[in-house]
């Protein structure tokens, strides 16, 4: 007869393992008991449990309510046990022993497996920034048995650094993601993908990257220099940008205070109907946590009566 | 035939110390495990230390621990129990018993006595 | 340490009758119980062991039944030379322990 194992049994940690062992024997070859023992180099043999065929299932003291029988029906040459609910110091070799009439004894070993699923955590980097150099991202660890792999998906263009590190059971993997920070960036997904043999799928972390930039200012409503005349309804200036975070927009004149009936809604200045009080310098002041920028425009209104033609300067400032 | 005849017991005071023998014959003495079971008088079976075949593993009750020392000489097919510090409470016939050697290669459960000497007391007074 | 009580400590019967004696372990024990008669003056002689294979040369009016935790030793015809004292023992764990035994008495 000959024993019939595995050379490894992979369960994932909390799972049952079926330790298999089963003597293929001649007809009339009986099995008399089963021995199994925890067999780590170095370290003496650790009984974990007997199957007699005449007193039954002893588990020892050390694994008292952790190790059974398979459910029935059992075939009586079916030595294999269950290891209830497997912890990681449970990984290791095992050995079983079967005593057998009249053929003897027959030895057999496996290792015992047990993978530790990783819970894999995102950490963002500091604050990105438009115009700052190559900057950390986002960092991702996952510790696991075996150490996991950790990679990113991601659409943004960066460059990826990992380190491991080894403890006693497990080992823990850190990967950093670096980026130039650029606007185009904003809002984009940034996932960290974390594979390994204990989970049915890869896990993922998603974080939304947001770079902070202010772009540069710029004023509308002068462009036709000819509708700024006095009486013309309707007038009015809007303030262009754009930013992360959302800009606040605040308007001022240089060359005094706001004319009376102007009203300001965020970044657009409305004009009641025209008059030459009007003419003036106006500033666009954009401001948001990163930064801020001014651009100012002369307003020039014109009398009709008049033939000299409207002047418009627009100035840019920041 | 299996025999086991145990000798070594008498009276003795208190704190003191006396040494059980038994020798076996009949049997391949070094391939089965030995025990000691003791009766107090008028009393039930108290097992008191069993020791395996090669001398490398013995087992204890904890009312005798640290006092009593199981050993075999297998070359003349003899098992011992010294019995040190005796107590009044130790007062009883002792017995030496051959275990049933059906589990083999697996130390944690011990099996049943299927032989017996004839037992030898041990009166422990002052 | 598990204990083993035995019931009942004592009984009277007559020759021919059908005597049961009961055991039960503190904890599970599979089959790792055996049992014991012994007669005034004399050692212990193993009856049953696996707690219903009968020794070699023990007679077979003499059954052991049960598993777990409850067992149990049927003598189905007491005879004369049955009137003794009977012990339980597991051996499940170290240290092995007695049932504190069963005096069977003549009525």
């Known amino acids: 007869g000959e024993l019939e194992t595995s050379d490894v049994v992979t369960v994932v940690l909390g799972q049952d393992a079926k330790l298999p062992c089963f003597y293929r024997g001649d007809s009339g070859e009986q099995v008399g008991q089963v021995a199994w023992a925890r067999v780590d180099a170095g370290e003496g043999a650790q009984e974990l449990a007997l199957l007699h065929s005449k007193y039954g299932l002893h588990v020892s003291p050390a694994y008292e309510g952790r190790v059974e029988q398979p459910p029935p029906p059992r075939n009586p040459l079916d030595g294999s046990v269950l290891l209830r609910n497997a912890v990681q110091a449970d990984e290791g070799e095992y050995e079983c022993r079967v005593s057998t009439f009249p053929a003897g004894s027959f030895q057999a070993r496996l290792r015992l497996r047990v993978l530790v699923p990783p819970l894999p955590s995102l950490n963002p980097g500091p604050a990105l920034e438009e115009g700052q150099g190559l900057t950390l991202a986002a960092s991702c660890t996952a510790e696991g048995s075996p150490a996991p792999s950790v990679t990113w998906d991601t659409e943004v263009k960066g460059t990826t650094s990992s380190r491991s590190f080894k403890h006693s059971r497990s080992a823990a993997v850190t990967s950093e993601f670096h980026l130039v920070p650029s606007r185009s960036m904003n809002g984009q997904p940034l996932t960290c993908v974390v594979s390994h043999p204990g989970l049915l799928q890869d896990q993922r972390i998603t974080h939304i990257l947001h770079v902070s930039f202010l772009a540069e200012a710029s004023v509308r409503g002068l462009e036709d220099q000819n509708l700024w005349h006095i009486g013309r309804e309707g007038a009015m200036l809007k303030c262009l940008s754009e930013g992360q975070p959302p800009p606040s927009y605040n308007w001022t004149r240089l060359d005094g205070p706001l004319p009376s009936g102007v009203r300001v809604d965020g970044d657009t200045l409305g004009f009641p109907p025209l008059t030459t009080e009007h003419s003036g310098i106006y500033v666009c002041h954009v401001s948001n946590e990163f930064s801020s920028r001014d651009s100012q425009v002369t307003v020039d209104v014109l009398d009709p009566q008049e033939d000299s033609g409207k002047q418009v300067d627009l100035v840019s400032a920041s | 035939e299996v025999q086991l005849v145990e000798s070594g017991g008498g009276l003795v005071q208190p704190g003191g110390s006396l040494r059980l023998s038994c020798a076996a014959s009949?049997?391949?003495?070094?391939?089965?495990?030995m025990s000691w079971v003791r009766q107090a008088p008028g009393k039930g079976l108290e097992w008191v230390s069993s020791?395996?075949?090669?001398?490398?593993?013995?087992h204890y009750a904890d009312s005798v621990k640290g006092r009593f020392t199981i050993s075999r000489d297998n070359s003349k097919n003899t098992l011992y129990l010294q019995m040190n510090s005796l107590r009044a409470e130790d007062t009883a016939v002792y017995y030496c018993?051959?275990?049933?050697?059906?589990?083999?290669?697996?130390?944690?459960?011990?099996?049943?006595?299927?032989?017996w000497g004839q037992g030898t007391l041990v009166t422990v007074s002052s | 340490d598990i204990q083993m009580t035995q019931s009942p400590s004592s009984l009277s019967a007559s020759v021919g009758d059908r005597v049961t004696i009961t055991c039960r372990a503190s904890?599970?024990?599979?089959?790792?119980l055996a049992w014991y008669q012994q007669k005034p003056g004399k050692a212990p002689k193993l009856l049953i062991y696996?707690?219903?294979s009968l020794q070699s040369g023990v007679p077979s009016r003499f059954s052991g039944s049960g598993s777990g935790t409850d067992f149990t030793l049927t003598i189905s015809s007491l005879q004369p030379e049955d009137f003794a004292t009977y012990y339980c023992?597991?051996?499940?764990?170290?240290?092995?322990?007695f049932g504190q035994g069963t005096k069977v008495e003549i009525k």
């Open positions: 020791i395996i075949g090669d001398d490398s593993t013995n």
């Open positions: 023992q597991q051996h499940y764990t170290t240290p092995p322990t």
């Open positions: 904890q599970g024990i599979s089959s790792y």
């Open positions: 009949g049997f391949n003495f070094t391939d089965y495990w």
């Open positions: 696996a707690a219903s």
């Open positions: 018993a051959r275990e049933y050697s059906d589990v083999v290669d697996y130390v944690s459960v011990r099996t049943p006595l299927d032989y």
